[in-house]
Amino acid sequence: ARNGDHCPLGPGRCCRLHTVRASLEDLGWADWVLSPREVQVTMCIGACPSQFRAANMHAQIKTSLHRLKPDTVPAPCCVPASYNPMVLIQKTDTGVSLQTYDDLLAKDCHCI
Amino acid sequence: ARNGDHCPLGPGRCCRLHTVRASLEDLGWADWVLSPREVQVTMCIGACPSQFRAANMHAQIKTSLHRLKPDTVPAPCCVPASYNPMVLIQKTDTGVSLQTYDDLLAKDCHCI
């Protein structure tokens, strides 16, 4: 139930995919990743107003209860709905390997 | 990679399962759900400090980048890792039906 994609807070303010450039040092990977030297990290950032990109029934419940009890129940949160794989060249105990990570880069976002 | 389950902020402050009692009116369901009259909604609430219950590599990246750029990159967020199904007795166009919802109640939480 991916509800409305219209952001009532104004363009770009609601939950969506952002790209953040990060070095291996930024990521804390310099000691085990050889390549790439820099990653364009895609991540989900933004507000989740009522029913915006609600991932499922649970997100809809959370929205309702947050409206009633904002100090107890947080608003839904902008998180990845799916991921893009990425391959890293990394140091291993036995040398160097190519390794694919399936859960590294956000592909699509929703509110939950 | 479900990292540490020790909460550095003190007992019960970090991401975990909470139960919130809600009526059909609270949930906005009074016009289409007949039973139950009240739901013990299990949801994920709490802080996600560094590496606490990190769901995957993406969550670990988010932690690192949040530390570097707290105004740009939010901390990981406490969300359901899995759900418990729940059956509702609901009104339909043709009468009344029993319907199972698989994404209504959080079963387990992680940070992402």
């Epitope: 050889l34 790439p36 990425m86 391959v87 060249i89 | -």
Partner: antibody
């Protein structure tokens, strides 16, 4: 513009060694890794190995392990491939190529012109 | 090691023809596949990477598709300069491996 210029053709006797150079220009050498590929006459492409231009870490094809050494010299933006104990079946054109690695994966976007190494008694 | 099998090994075609070359990996390689074109006496040239992304400067008549184990390179309308040998290559794991090549010849 990006260029990889390799050293000239070599004729070697069996048992000898050869060292092929690959000089890079038009980009920051240490930011892109290098692979070496060879092609025997009338045959397909065979990957020989990879070297990090920054750290010098290497990965070699199993069949060449112990006979091949890849190095880089960042001060001259040059990569080297040395092959020892040459045999007649090492006769091939040897290529270096620049490695492009980002979120779209790995590919080899610029290639040297190739160096013909002939092993003959 | 991951084996890459290309078919056909050669194909005869005319200018304007649609040409399809397939590449099969011996195990799943996600979308970590590239296609190269090689002309006699020349170095290989990158055409497609990440299975379907067109390298900058490569004509749009070249396209790639597939993921997992089965991949395709398509030339939508063969041009005179396209007669060459084409290689697929997996960059999923070391050792990096190439297919045996497909020679596109003039009919």
């Amino acid at each position: 513009q990006v260029q990889l210029v390799q050293s000239g053709a070599e004729v070697k006797k069996p048992g000898a060694s050869v060292k092929v150079s690959c000089k890079a220009s038009g980009y920051t050498f240490a930011s892109y890794d290098i692979i070496w590929v060879r092609q025997a006459p009338g045959q397909g492409l065979e990957w020989m190995g990879w070297i990090s231009a920054l750290s010098g870490d290497t990965v070699y094809a199993q069949k060449l392990q112990g006979r091949v050494t890849m190095t880089t010299d960042t001060s001259t933006s040059t990569a080297y491939m040395e092959l020892r104990s040459l045999r007649s079946d090492d006769t091939a054109v040897y290529y270096c190529a620049r490695t492009r690695h980002d979120t779209s994966g790995i590919r080899f976007d610029y290639w040297g012109q190739g160096t013909l190494v002939t092993v003959s008694s | 090691d991951i084996q890459m099998t290309q078919s056909p090994s050669s194909v005869s075609a005319s200018v304007g023809d649609r040409v399809t070359i397939t590449c099969r990996a011996s195990q799943g390689i996600d979308s970590w596949l590239a296609w190269y074109q090689q002309k006699p006496g020349k170095a290989p040239k990158l055409l497609i990477y990440a299975a379907s992304s067109l390298q900058s400067g490569v004509p749009s008549r070249f396209s790639g598709s597939g993921s997992g184990t089965d991949f395709t390179l398509t030339i939508s309308s063969l041009q005179p300069e396209d007669f060459a040998t084409y290689y697929c290559q997996q960059v999923h794991s070391f050792p990096i491996t190439f297919g045996g090549g497909t020679k596109v010849e003039i009919k």
